[in-house]
């Protein structure tokens, strides 16, 4: 993916620490594109609406993510 | 423990360079983003410079900015600070500094320092 | 650009007594401030975030308050080694990122 003059990645600092699924209110992937090279985890939180960018290397996190979809996937119909 | 070690300070001309570098050690280096804040003698504090833990995302003080470049090598748990067009206003002690890993940055552990003077 | 004011520039005081420090913002940073204490010929230290949170290994005595354009430090019994400069910082999601010109809290 060719960058774009402008950089327009979020995170500055990432997280590995695990994050209980239930503590959260928005998990938001944002794939790689022409503006970021890389993907990018942000975490919100219930607590104070708190956000927080995630490793998306570290296994914590990548279980973080399977446990979320398979939450979304038991309750889709 | 988290160490940060501030060196390549020194006595320079105006209009020449010089480069600082901050070696990192007990903490995961390649998660945190890294900054410089430097402090004019007797002056508060200002923050100069930010690279993201991957290298991608720079931002500049408005007071350095296309003259100063911040680099970082993951390998070497290093960051830089290439400094050039130096003027007497750049005098001061240039720190390293770690962010604090939240979405909204504040600096959790700092180096010693390393002054920079810009003196004919 | 966020601009932080600090009142006083000097707080003189004795051992014992209470500090409180104050910071106001140009503009409402919700609860995103930082307090830092900076002895003389050191690097700055990192004493509460978020307004409100002491960082690690910080004593009890040392407490934030505040939200919006006003902030407190506090410090409610000075101990020898409070006497200091500190500094607030605003700790907005984008640069760049300013600090007050700082408190300096010295013996009376």
């Known amino acids: 993916v060719p960058l774009s003059r402008t950089v327009r990645c979020t995170c500055i600092s990432i997280s590995n620490q695990p994050v209980n699924p239930r503590s959260l209110e928005k998990l938001e992937i944002i794939p790689a594109s022409q503006f970021c090279p890389r993907v990018e985890i942000i975490a919100t939180m219930k607590k104070k609406g708190e956000k927080r960018c995630l490793n998306p290397e570290s296994k914590a996190i990548k279980n973080l993510l399977k446990a979320v979809s398979k939450e979304r996937s038991k309750r889709s119909p | 423990q988290v160490q940060l070690v501030d060196s390549g300070g020194g006595v320079v001309q105006p209009g020449r360079s010089l480069r600082l570098s901050c070696a990192a050690s007990g903490f995961t280096f390649n998660t945190y983003g890294m900054h410089w804040v430097r402090q004019a003698p007797g002056k508060g504090l200002e923050w100069v410079a930010v690279?993201?833990?991957?290298?991608?995302?720079?931002h500049y003080a408005d007071s350095v900015k296309g003259r100063f470049t911040i680099t970082r090598d993951n390998s070497k748990n290093m960051v830089h600070l290439q400094m050039n067009s130096l003027r007497a206003e750049d005098t001061a002690v240039y720190y390293c500094?770690?962010?604090?890993?939240?979405?909204?940055?504040?600096?959790?552990?700092w180096g010693q320092g390393t002054l920079v003077t810009v003196s004919s | 650009e966020i601009v932080l004011t600090q009142s006083p520039a000097t707080l003189s005081l004795s051992p014992g007594e209470r500090a409180t420090l104050s910071c106001r913002a140009s503009?409402?940073?919700?609860?995103?401030v930082a307090w830092y204490q900076q002895k003389p010929g050191q690097a700055p230290r990192l004493l509460i975030y978020d307004a409100s949170n002491r960082a690690t290994g910080i004593p009890a005595r040392f407490s934030g308050s505040g939200s919006g354009t006003d902030f407190t430090l506090t410090i409610s019994s000075l101990e020898p080694e409070d006497f200091a400069i500190y500094y607030c910082?605003?700790?907005?999601?984008?640069?760049?990122?300013?600090f007050g010109q700082g408190t300096k809290v010295e013996i009376k």
């Open positions: 500094a770690r962010d604090s890993s939240s979405w909204y940055v504040y600096f959790d552990y």
């Open positions: 690279i993201s833990y991957d290298g991608i995302i720079k």
């Open positions: 503009q409402s940073v919700s609860s995103y």
């Open positions: 910082q605003q700790r907005s999601n984008s640069p760049p990122w300013t």
